[in-house]
């Protein structure tokens, strides 16, 4: 009786089955009655990852420096290349496949969190006793400055944007 | 349909060189393997070698030394060459496919002077 | 190279009676992927070998089911329950596990 369902790791092609390509490699020919199921390796810059039956390789995924792209891990020919943005850029997507600029944090807003090659900056407004007075895509909020510790009072009052103006206290004649 | 069809010499003259071709239709030799039996006169099959779909080729250990099979998949050809022949070369050459039963209808190569 | 021998060289048998035909080989045919690729070939004069069976067991498409394969490893038997005057021939295994592949001296089945 021919198979209706074969073992992991085979295909059912013909009445019979064959063993599937490990990764790294694609399919030629189909086994027979005579002969095993025939694979070749990938080429260079081709990869597969997973046991197959494809007729072609994938190729490497290209990491294009004019959409600010650069390798972060080379491609096998069982993995993909994977690609990250240059200094100062992220992904837009999950694939990588193309990068913008981090955000900067306006005035009011400090960094909650840096962004990285795959994640952009991350902010939030600052609280009450904090500021952050430039655009910035690294600088945290910054606490007021704390006039009573240097023996100073509170000659302006600190917002989100700026700080406390600290002056001296009135001498007391 | 799947068809091969062998054509030879007929009359090869000893230490001379025997060229064959095997033109096949109805499938492709990028993804099917060819091998070549030869069966001399009363005696039984022999097999000489065999081109991969990938290819490559592999052969008898006998024959090894002056037999090369090649193919111009382009062309749907698969082509035997065996050089130095002797009276014993002489056989009915076959092109055969390797799923199913595929055969040639063989070609008779006779080595006499 | 694989040795492949038949036995016997010749097979007269009785129109109705069953015929068996053994062929060893001089290595395991099993393959590392788990198949065995033993087979057997009837040839008629006058015609290139026709397959009859591959794989010890499976019979080639249009084969009649008197024809059956068994065995493993090294041993193998083609069976014929039933005879009949058109499987008169040679019969010959062949191995094409291991290259280069090779074939047995065959068998003469002959009607008595």
């Known amino acids: 009786e021919p198979p209706t369902a074969c073992r992991e790791k085979q295909y059912l092609i013909n009445s019979q089955c064959c063993s599937l390509c490990q990764p790294g490699q694609k399919l030629v020919s189909d086994c027979t009655e005579f002969t095993e199921t025939e694979c070749l390796p990938c080429g260079e810059s081709e990869f597969l990852d997973t046991w197959n039956r494809e007729t072609h390789c994938h190729q490497h995924k290209y990491c294009d420096p004019n959409l600010g792209l650069r390798v972060q891990q080379k491609g096998t020919s069982e993995t993909d290349t994977i690609c990250t943005c240059e200094e100062g850029w992220h992904c837009t997507s999950e694939a990588c496949e193309s990068c913008v600029l981090h955000r900067s944090c306006s005035p009011g807003f400090g960094v909650k969190q840096i962004a990285t090659g795959v994640s952009d900056t991350i902010c939030e407004p600052c609280p009450v006793g904090f500021f952050s007075n430039v655009s910035s895509a690294f600088e945290k909020c910054h606490p007021w400055t704390s006039c009573e510790t240097k023996d100073l009072v509170v000659q302006q009052a600190g917002t989100n944007k700026t700080d406390v103006v600290c002056g001296p206290q009135d001498r007391l004649r | 349909q799947v068809q091969l069809q062998e054509s030879g010499p007929g009359l090869v003259k000893p230490s001379e060189t025997l060229s064959i071709t095997c033109t096949v239709s109805?499938?492709?030799?990028?993804?099917?393997?060819v091998y070549w039996i030869r069966q001399p006169p009363g005696k039984g099959p022999e097999w000489m070698g065999m081109?991969?779909?990938?290819?490559?080729?592999d052969y008898s250990t006998s024959l090894k030394s002056r037999l090369t099979i090649s193919k111009d998949t382009s062309k749907s050809q698969v082509s035997l060459k065996m050089s130095s022949l002797t009276a014993a070369d002489t056989a009915v050459y076959y092109c055969?496919?390797?799923?199913?039963?595929?055969w040639g209808q063989g070609t008779l190569v006779t080595v006499s002077s | 190279d694989i040795v492949m021998t038949q036995s016997p060289l010749s097979l007269p048998v009785t129109p109705g009676q069953p015929a068996s035909i053994s062929c060893r080989s001089s290595?395991?045919?099993?393959?590392?992927?788990?198949?065995?690729?033993l087979h057997w070939y009837l040839q008629k004069p006058g015609q290139s070998p026709r397959l009859l069976i591959y794989?010890?067991?499976n019979r080639f498409s249009g084969v009649p089911d008197r024809f059956s394969g068994s065995g493993s490893g090294t041993d193998f038997t083609l069976k014929i329950s039933r005879v009949e005057a058109e499987d008169v021939g040679v019969y010959y295994c062949?191995?094409?596990?291991?290259?280069?592949?090779?074939f047995g001296g065959g068998t003469k089945l002959e009607i008595k």
């Open positions: 081109m991969w779909g990938g290819g490559s080729t």
């Open positions: 794989k010890v067991s």
């Open positions: 055969v496919r390797t799923d199913g039963d595929y």
């Open positions: 062949s191995q094409s596990t291991h290259v280069p592949w090779t």
């Open positions: 290595q395991s045919l099993a393959s590392s992927q788990g198949n065995t690729y």
């Open positions: 109805g499938f492709s030799l990028s993804r099917y393997s």
